[in-house]
């Protein structure tokens, strides 16, 4: 039993960022005369939070009128709580004097601030990679409290397991950040695939935040090349077709070479999309056989997405009879397709 007890009934209070926090404090006696002050933290470095007598504390208001006769309730309300307000708050009774003498402190109330994590931001690799290669995606979310948080990765709805996650800082802090890296093995079918970073936290009340990244930003599907000749027309012209299939992204340049000399260059644009998100493109070249004495070597050269050129060559025989053209032509591949 004591002459004066300073009662802080709550050991801890948890408040959502932006809300108000009520810190309760009552005293068992108003004697001896002296003020009540609120501090955050203990010891010489403690921070004055509220003092009725003097000072300007715009975010702090007393719950009861402190000037009311026989008031023994010195609870305060702190508005617009931020993670920086977290800490242990002490209600302290002073005995009037010159200066006032600290008489008794309450047991303290720990204020923890529940702050929502920021929307997860997912970033992919800086350069594209091809199928069978592994790429890394990073997910970051900041400003949450308390520290406990769950982060999961999904690819097309399936949870990924090759994941490394860190929450910083490791020690006590007003707020925390999470950074996670997921490693994904690409396939040719991933143009339409999506990775999702899902963050669950107590402040989100079961409705996790999601960040997404499209694998279309990370993948390159190299084209297949095929060069074919249509039957010779009556006007001694041969139609040679270069079929470029199953490539992504669309950025592609095709060059025709006749006997090593550039005949025509084309850029792919506004191509229709295949079901799997890849593109096809067909280019043809008319060769006037009668204008050539010797066989014509045609090359379809494709530069895809800034990668080294891929060539496919075809020889048009001009020495044979037109009717026999189909059986006397020979195709020659001078490049290798990326698969």
């Amino acid at each position: 039993e004591e002459e004066l007890q300073v009662i802080q009934p709550e050991k801890s209070v948890s408040v959502a960022a932006g809300d108000s926090a009520t810190l309760n404090c009552t005293v068992s006696s108003l004697i001896p005369v002296g003020p009540i002050q609120w501090f955050r933290g203990a010891g010489p470095g403690r921070e004055l939070i509220y003092n009725l007598k003097e000072g300007h504390f715009p975010r702090v208001t007393p719950v009861s009128d402190p000037t009311k006769r026989n008031n023994m309730d010195f609870s305060i309300r702190i508005s617009n709580i931020t993670p920086a307000d977290a800490g242990t708050y002490y209600c302290v009774k002073f005995r009037k004097g010159s200066p006032d003498v600290e008489l008794k402190s309450g047991a303290g109330t720990e204020l923890s601030v529940r702050a929502k994590p920021s929307a997860p931001v997912v970033s992919g690799p800086a350069v594209r990679a091809t199928a069978e290669h592994t790429v890394s995606f990073t997910c970051e979310s900041h400003g949450f409290s308390p520290r406990d948080i769950t982060l999961k990765w999904f690819k097309n709805g399936n949870e990924l397991s090759d994941v490394q996650t860190n929450v910083d800082p490791a020690g006590k802090s007003v707020s925390y950040s999470i950074r996670s890296t997921a490693r994904v093995v690409l396939t040719r079918r991933d143009v339409h695939s999506q990775v999702i970073c899902e963050v669950a936290h107590v402040t989100l009340q079961g409705d996790p935040l999601r960040g997404t990244a499209n694998l279309s930003e990370a993948i390159r599907v190299p084209p297949f090349l095929e060069v074919t000749q249509q039957s010779m027309r009556a006007d001694n012209q041969v139609n040679v077709t270069c079929q470029v299939t199953k490539f992504y992204p669309q950025r592609l340049q095709l060059t025709w070479l006749e006997n090593g000399n550039v005949s025509r260059t084309e850029m792919a644009s506004a191509l229709p999309e295949n079901k799997d998100g890849t593109y096809n493109w067909t280019s043809w070249l008319l060769v006037n056989v009668s204008a050539h004495r010797d066989d014509v070597k045609l090359t379809c050269q494709v530069e895809h997405d800034g990668q080294p050129a891929v060539n496919k060559s075809f020889s048009v025989k001009v020495s044979a009879h037109p009717k026999e053209q189909g059986s006397n032509t020979a195709a020659e591949n001078t490049g290798t397709n990326e698969r």
């Epitope: 004697i31 002296g34 003020p35 000037t67 009311k68």
Partner: antibody, heavy 114, light 111 residues
Framework: EVQLEESGPGLVAPSQSLSITCTVS????????VNWVRQPPGKGLEWLGI???????DYNSALKSRLSISKDNSKSQVFLKMNSLQSDDTARYYC????????WGQGTSVTVSS | DIVLTQSPASLAVSLGQGATISCRAS??????????MHWYQQKPGQPPKPLIY???NLESGVPARFSGSGSRTDFTLTIDPVEADDAATYYC?????????FGGGTKLEIK
């Protein structure tokens, strides 16, 4: 039950010092302050000083130079020492609990006389 | 020092009537919304007995016939109705500023 009991010499010669003990029960001296108050015969009450639960003291400025209040928490005793007594220090000396003075001892009578 | 002046110095009241004792402080005894003024009753050969604390709060065990009022510098103790057992000397006391001081006392006589 809260009780306070003063014990003193009864008679003190002029210019000598006075020592009074207040023995308390029913409460702890670490949790409560104890006051000393005196009352000359047929006159009013005069506050002398207080020793708080933490051991700090406050005195009546008019008597501060002659007064000393101390305590022994383990023995539940509070001590009043007053120097250079004169005849006008003749009074009944009381100890009373806390800033509220809610419990009083019966007092001990001190006469300053040769 | 805060000087407390009680009036009257003595008064005689008939049994069953009301008695009013005044205490005036030389400066305010209010702090932090409260008046640090208290009232005590003392009978001959006995120590003072607390009646009222913080100007208007009744100590436990004290009959409701006793009441206190006032703020800042002017305070009143009222006993209504008085009983024979109320014959005593009444003191006001402040503990807002050091040194704590008592009023000179008011002697109540029952007629």
């Amino acid at each position: 039950e809260v009780q306070l009991e003063e014990s003193g010499p009864g008679l003190v010669a002029p210019s000598q010092s006075l020592s009074i003990t207040c023995t308390v029960s029913g409460f702890s001296l670490t949790g409560y302050g104890v006051n000393w108050v005196r009352q000359p015969p047929g006159k009013g009450l005069e506050w002398l000083g207080i020793i708080w639960g933490d051991g700090s003291t406050d005195y009546n400025s008019a008597l501060k130079s002659r007064l000393s209040i101390s305590k022994d928490n383990s023995k539940s005793q509070v001590f009043l020492k007053m120097n250079s007594l004169q005849s006008d220090d003749t009074a009944r000396y009381y100890c009373a609990r806390a800033g509220k003075m809610d419990y009083w001892g019966q007092g001990t009578s001190v006469t300053v006389s040769s | 020092d805060i000087v407390l002046t009680q009036s009257p110095a003595s008064l005689a009241v008939s049994l069953g009537q009301g008695a009013t004792i005044s205490c005036r402080a030389s400066e305010s005894v209010d702090s932090y919304g409260n008046s640090f003024m208290h009232w005590y009753q003392q009978k001959p050969g006995q120590p003072p007995k607390p009646l009222i604390y913080l100007a208007s709060n009744l100590e436990s065990g004290v009959p409701a016939r006793f009441s206190g009022s006032g703020s800042r510098t002017d305070f009143t103790l009222t006993i209504d109705p008085v009983e024979a057992d109320d014959a005593a000397t009444y003191y006001c006391q402040q503990n807002n500023e050091y040194p704590w001081t008592f009023g000179g006392g008011t002697k109540l006589e029952i007629k």
